[in-house]
């Protein structure tokens, strides 16, 4: 029972984590304009892995994709790669773990097979989580490195998106989403690996016993029959996530109801 719970919880935690990694990858707020020097700006900049956006205080938001591949810095490409690898590994891990779940019966699958699949998915989740954490951390390090450089040009050649001396960037919401999601995926993976140990069939010390019947010699090996739950799961797993794309219709939040500027 504890094994099933650990496996199920590991699966759910990993599912949430991978949904978070996908959301973080799609979000535009990887870096947001630092407002320390200009808290009353009428133009707010934020950037993601795929495009950069400008939100005017008039309520309009304009986003422009990075329509270049060769012009992008290697670090940004590396972050993209890490996040995509994390998503792909996580997705495969989810697929494998669905079939490995103890509460789901598929044909005459042996527990040893389920244990192997659980271990495989667990390892995939761990690597997926590490990829996401690494990707977010590399980007965060890139921001910290550029923060104090007044002539920072982090995105040189990004479709003409060049920072001016005035625009400094700090950690965006996507970084925190990514760190948390990566952590959850990692935890889920560890739980799957722990569950795998409980799923693995233990070696029995019983010897085969021969029962001699008149005219026939039949050998019976105890422990060859396994109990299983006869309930197939018909629940569907739905992944729902917000890609984080901001629109001009989004309700804007402000520090107070009345701002004096």
């Amino acid at each position: 029972m504890a094994v099933t719970a650990c496996q199920g919880l590991g699966f759910v935690v990993s599912l949430i984590g991978i949904a978070g990694i996908i959301a973080a990858t799609c979000m535009d707020q990887w870096s947001t304009q630092d407002l320390y020097n200009n808290p009353v700006t009428a133009v707010f900049n934020y950037q993601g892995l795929w495009r950069s956006c400008v939100r005017e205080s008039s309520g309009f938001t304009e986003c422009r994709g990075y329509f270049t591949l060769l012009g992008l810095p290697a670090m940004l490409q590396a972050v993209r790669a890490l996040m995509i690898v994390g998503i792909v590994l996580g997705a495969i891990g989810l697929l494998v773990s669905i079939f490995a779940l103890k509460c789901i019966r598929i044909g005459s699958m042996e527990d040893s097979a389920k244990a192997n699949m659980t271990l495989t998915s667990g390892i995939m989740f761990i690597v997926s989580g590490l990829c996401a954490i690494a990707g977010v951390s590399v980007f965060a390090n890139m921001l910290v490195t550029n923060f104090w450089m007044s002539t920072a040009n982090m995105y040189t050649g990004m479709g003409g998106m060049v920072q001016t001396v005035q625009t400094r960037y700090t950690f965006g919401a996507a970084l925190f989403v990514g760190w948390v999601a990566g952590g959850l995926t990692l935890i889920g993976g560890v739980m799957m690996c722990i569950a795998c140990r409980g799923l693995a069939p233990e070696e029995t010390n019983y010897k085969a016993v021969s029962y001699h019947a008149s005219g026939h010699s039949v050998a019976y090996k105890p422990g060859g029959f396994k109990a299983s739950t006869g309930f197939g799961s018909n629940t569907k797993n739905k992944k729902i996530y917000d890609g984080g794309a901001r629109t001009e219709d989004e309700v804007q939040s402000y520090p107070s109801k009345h701002d004096y500027v």
Epitope: V43, S57, S58, V251
Partner: antibody, heavy 118, light 113 residues
Framework: QVQLVQSGAEVKKPGSSVKVSCKAS????????MNWVRQAPGQGLEWMGQ????????KYSGKFNSRVTITADESTSTAYMELSSLRSEDTAVYYC???????????WGQGTLVTVSS | DIVMTQSPDSLAVSLGERATINCKSS????????????LTWYQQKPGQPPKLLIY???TRESGVPDRFSGSGSGTDFTLTISSLQAEDVAVYYC?????????FGQGTKLEIK
């Protein structure tokens, strides 16, 4: 077409308050910030503040030291600007103007002359 | 606050001649995120409210004659009327749209010589 129609001219005593209205039509009033700008006789333009009618959010110029209150009524598509503790130097034409893409004021009301005189 | 300074205060130009109005801001109006200058030009004729002419320093508002053009970046901007017409007699204002409070230049009065 977009139209901003302001209330008529007012004559006020020093120390009193004035409330100017601005009725909008021809666009989704709730979705655009409304600015208030004043112009003293023979002088330049001076931004006072703005309101987002959709949620009542406001931003004010620090110069007016809490003397100005901007409100909006979504049901009538009307924005209001109230200026209290009036002084003679508050004599000016007060304009409402819609805030648009590019942080510009693209449509303006016809203006309301407020005269502060004892 | 960003201070907007226009020069000259008044300008007299002959019909058909070029008129140039300058505007200087105390801080940059160039936004790094989209490489746009948040500088707007307005025209105000006597007894009328201001009219939007040019935004983002150089983008003409629809319906504005092409004799009006804007240029400049960062802190220095220019409004140019290539061939002055009688109906262009007005006061011209530049406005900062980059930072609160939104501020205007003191205005430049354009007259016919």
């Amino acid at each position: 077409q977009v139209q901003l129609v302001q209330s008529g001219a007012e004559v006020k005593k020093p120390g009193s308050s004035v409330k100017v209205s601005c009725k909008a039509s021809g666009y989704a009033f709730s979705n655009y910030w409304m600015n208030w700008v004043r112009q003293a006789p023979g002088q330049g333009l001076e931004w006072m503040g703005q309101i987002y009618p959709g949620n009542g959010d406001t931003k004010y110029s620090g110069k007016f030291n809490s003397r100005v209150t901007i409100t909006a009524d979504e049901s009538t598509s009307t924005a209001y600007m109230e200026l209290s503790s009036l002084r003679s130097e508050d004599t000016a034409v007060y304009y409402c103007a819609r805030f648009y893409y590019g942080n510009v004021m693209d449509y303006w009301g016809q203006g309301t002359l407020v005269t502060v005189s004892s | 606050d960003i201070v907007m300074t226009q020069s000259p205060d008044s300008l007299a130009v002959s019909l058909g001649e070029r008129a140039t109005i300058n505007c200087k801001s105390s801080q940059t109006l160039l936004n790094g995120g989209n490489q746009k200058n948040y500088l707007t030009w307005y025209q105000q004729k006597p007894g009328q409210p201001p009219k939007l002419l040019i935004y983002w320093a150089s983008t003409r508002e629809s319906g504005v004659p092409d004799r009006f053009s804007g240029s400049g970046s960062g802190t220095d901007f220019t409004l140019t009327i290539s061939s002055l017409q009688a109906e262009d007699v007005a006061v011209y204002y530049c406005q900062n749209g980059y930072s609160y409070p939104l501020t205007f230049g003191q205005g430049t009065k354009l007259e016919i010589k």
